[in-house]
Interface confidence: medium
């Protein structure tokens, strides 16, 4: 949950190209104004995933998900909350 | 704001070579399964995508990191 | 009941063009990627293009590369392979197979065949 | 590119005998292996997907094993109707075919 907070477009994006759909790429991809030549990209990886199979995306997704709540990240999730919380409080 | 630990991750999925990649998973997950697959899914990437694929594809995640949506 | 049925084949001399057809029926057309895979007399299979499920993505073996036009219309329900510049050695039974959803199972099922022969 | 080497090229099998084909990749293709099951003067029809997953309505005798760079398609038990061509296919960057194993009836 909060990885996907951190940065929601992007891990939309991740799981539509890992998920194999296309359809549910070109959403996501819209939502950021892709161009043809961007969505053509996008398109190539998502190939790679759909050609490998559902055991290839389960585990790449496992990789996405480890790094994204990693200390490397939480840590400076907690470190973003502390910030905000403190421009919060001096805001007040 | 995207974790530097998944841009890094990206970036190299993208730019760098099949070893740096796999290198920079195993500091996360070190199962061999999943280095195994994540050395396919590169190769496959680098395979398929020419340069100007990987400049559009970055310059998608500029889009996507710079969003208001992140 | 999954129907594909391959059609345009037949003799055009070195340097011809030729376009094959594909007419899918008894599934969804738009949902699956497509293949074409063509067989010489006697010979394995070769596989020479697909193509995404909207048309997006397209791949071709670097034997037709530049030569071969994958494209598809939903709509219709139709495959199609533009084949320019014919070669004699790409003489074969050019088949149309599909994929299962997303991929999850390249050619399950497969059409007849047509026969292209390049020859003068 | 990668490349399918399958072996035997040929087999000549005596019915209820065990066939084993092997596929080796030229470099590692996790599971993104197939097996096609090729009789004359008809299409290739999937036997199994995915290295080790059978196709709905392939006979049980038809298994698959294998991940990276070996793979074995094994009939358990040959009947006639098993001489064939068979074919493996890899699936993990674009695509490409092995040679073909033919396998004869005694």
């Known amino acids: 949950v909060k990885m996907a907070e951190t940065c929601p477009i992007f891990y939309d994006v991740f799981f539509a190209v890992a998920n194999g759909n296309e359809l549910l790429l070109d959403l996501s991809l819209t939502k950021v104004n892709a161009t043809e030549p961007e969505r053509t990209a996008m398109k190539k990886i998502q190939d790679c995933y759909v050609e490998n199979g559902l055991i290839s995306r389960v585990l790449d997704g496992l990789v996405m998900t480890t790094i994204s709540s990693s200390k490397d990240c939480m840590g400076e999730a907690v470190q973003n909350t502390v910030e905000d919380l403190k421009l919060n409080t001096l805001g007040r | 704001e995207i974790c530097p630990a998944v841009k890094r991750d990206v970036d190299l999925f993208l730019t760098g070579t099949p070893d740096e990649y796999v290198e920079q998973v195993a500091q996360y997950k070190a199962l061999p399964v999943v280095l195994e697959n994540a050395r396919i899914l590169k190769n496959c990437v680098d395979a398929k995508m020419t340069e100007e694929d990987k400049e559009n594809a970055l310059s998608l995640l500029d889009k996507i990191y710079t969003s208001p949506l992140c | 009941e999954v129907q594909l049925v391959e059609s345009g084949g037949g003799l055009v001399k070195p340097g011809g063009s030729l376009r094959l057809s594909c007419a899918a029926s008894g599934f969804t057309f738009s949902d699956y990627y497509m293949n074409w895979i063509r067989q010489a007399p006697g010979k394995g299979l070769e596989w020479v293009s697909y193509i995404s499920s909207s048309g997006s993505s397209i791949y071709y073996a670097d034997s037709v590369k530049g030569r071969f036009t994958i494209s598809r219309d939903n709509a219709k329900n139709s495959l199609y392979l533009l084949m320019n510049s014919l070669r004699a050695e790409d003489t074969a039974v050019y088949y149309c197979a599909r994929d299962g959803k997303y991929n999850s199972s390249p050619g399950d099922y497969w059409g007849q065949g047509t026969l292209v022969t390049v020859s003068s | 590119e990668i490349v399918l080497t399958q072996s035997p090229d040929f087999q000549s099998v005596t019915p209820k005998e065990k066939v084993t084909i092997t596929c080796r990749a030229s470099q590692s293709i996790g599971g993104s292996l197939h097996w096609y099951q090729q009789k004359p003067d008809q299409s290739p029809k999937l036997l199994i997907k995915?290295?080790?997953q059978s196709f709905s309505g392939v006979p049980s005798r038809f298994s698959g094993s294998g991940s990276g760079t070996d793979f074995t398609l094994t009939i358990n038990s040959l009947e006639a109707e098993d001489a064939a061509t068979y074919y493996c296919?890899?699936?993990?960057?674009?695509?490409?075919f092995g040679q073909g194993t033919k396998v004869e009836i005694k």
């Open positions: 995915y290295a080790s």
């Open positions: 296919l890899q699936s993990s960057s674009l695509r490409t």
